[in-house]
């Protein structure tokens, strides 16, 4: 299980409309459910139940976003509509270029994501927990545009992002 280096860029807008970018670094792990690849895109928070809908909307998602899913305690969802792996698969089907799971409340999900799959996803499936997960969710819960870059080696430069 390799370390995933995640850089999150937050676009902070001032009342005048100017904006600055803030970069936060955190680490997670690449799970065996997906590929150990770099990926980047805008962060879109997805509720675990939001991944249950199986309808015609699935092909309507544009490619290239990074899905962030905070998993709930297993007791709160005793009969999940999909396994954690199934949720990752559904997000990728919908166009996610990567999926990041916050497993702090559901550490058992780590084993589910790391069970050797004969057909792993072609996109990275990363899990975060503890302080890194708190950092990530604090960013995701802000009313800001945020972008994630996932790398499988430490970033060379902390701000390789666009000049806005």
């Amino acid at each position: 299980k390799e370390t995933a280096f995640v850089e999150v860029v937050l676009f902070e807008s001032s009342p005048s409309g100017d904006y600055t970018t803030y970069t936060t670094g955190l680490t997670g792990r690449f799970s065996r459910a997906g590929a150990t690849l770099s990926a980047e895109g805008e962060i879109v928070q997805m509720h675990p139940l939001g991944l249950c809908n199986n309808n015609d909307e699935e092909d309507l998602y544009e490619y290239g976003w990074v899905g962030v899913v905070k998993l709930e305690q297993p007791e709160l969802d005793p009969k999940p509509c999909l396994t954690v792996l199934g949720k990752a698969k559904r997000a990728v089907q919908r166009g996610a270029t990567a999926v990041i799971f916050d497993v702090s409340e559901n550490p058992e999900a780590i084993d589910q994501l790391n069970q050797g799959s004969e057909d792993p996803l072609k996109r990275p499936v990363v899990y975060v927990k503890g302080a890194d997960a708190i950092k990530l969710m604090n960013i995701v819960n802000k009313q800001k545009v945020a972008r994630a870059r996932i790398q499988h080696r430490p970033p060379r430069q902390p701000t390789e992002y666009f000049d806005m």
């Epitope: 676009f11 807008s13 770099s38 990926a39 980047e40 895109g41 805008e42 879109v44 928070q45 997805m46 939001g50 809908n53 909307e57 309507l60 998602y61 544009e62 490619y63 290239g64 976003w65 270029t97 995701v140 819960n141 802000k142 009313q143 800001k144 545009v145 945020a146 972008r147 870059r149 996932i150 790398q151 390789e160 666009f162 000049d163 806005m164």
Partner: antibody
């Protein structure tokens, strides 16, 4: 079927404000970022600004401070408030679906705003 | 902001001809994170809203005829229309969405 329908345009005197709406249907609106793009008569396309699924906003330099993009996910509606209208704001305004660093696959039919006394 | 330089401004061709429209960006649009070029091509017919033709520089949007071909990487991109049809009469725009989005100035395609 994805549909985006703009409304609220018309003839407005300079200096006034106007609020455009874009009603969305056929997709989970709350999961999407949305853009406003405008096109002055006989001219090219100009990006105006963006609102993320969680209501973060980014604007083009030309409109900063005067334009405000908002959304009401419960009503599946995107808004563009234009303050202190100028003649150069005369354009067809389109809403389009897509993430900030994404392309726009779906566009509305556009709504015309004419600023003139 | 990234500047998109599109050429030519207009061109008139006969049905069956091949057309090439160029777009050059002031900086690379190739993402090191996913190796995709953040460039799209749009067609806008008179009185209509723009329609997506090509995304990621070379991927044709579903339903778009295969005579529309996008190519290029980094800073130089091309839209080629082979076997031009009367219904291709339109304005064509490139869009960079690597950072704050910017469109090319547009190319007006006229049929002789």
């Amino acid at each position: 079927e994805v549909q985006l329908v703009e409304s609220g345009g018309g003839l407005v005197p300079p200096g006034k404000s106007l609020k455009l709406s874009c009603s969305a249907s056929g997709f989970p609106f709350s999961n999407y970022g949305m853009h406003w793009i405008r096109q002055a008569p006989g001219k090219g396309l100009d990006w105006v600004g963006y609102i993320s699924s969680n209501s973060g906003t980014i604007y083009a330099d030309a409109v900063k401070g005067r334009f405000t993009i908002s959304r009401d996910n419960a009503k599946n509606t995107l808004y563009l408030l234009i303050n202190s209208l100028k003649s150069e704001d005369t354009a067809m305004y389109y809403c389009a679906r897509g993430y900030f660093d994404g392309y726009y696959r779906f566009w509305g039919q556009g709504v015309m705003v004419t600023v003139s006394s | 902001d990234i500047v998109m330089t599109q050429s030519p401004f207009s061109l008139a061709v006969s049905e069956g001809d091949m057309v090439t429209i160029m777009c050059r960006s002031s900086q690379s649009l190739l993402s090191s994170g996913n190796q995709k070029n953040y460039l799209a091509w749009y067609q806008q017919k008179p009185g209509q809203s723009p329609k997506l033709l090509i995304y990621h520089a070379s991927t044709r949007q579903s339903g778009v005829p295969d005579r529309f071909i996008g190519s290029g990487s980094g800073t130089d991109f091309t839209l080629t229309i082979s076997d031009v049809q009367a219904e291709d009469l339109a304005d064509y725009y490139c869009l960079q969405h690597y950072s704050s989005p910017t469109f090319g100035s547009g190319t007006k395609l006229e049929i002789k």
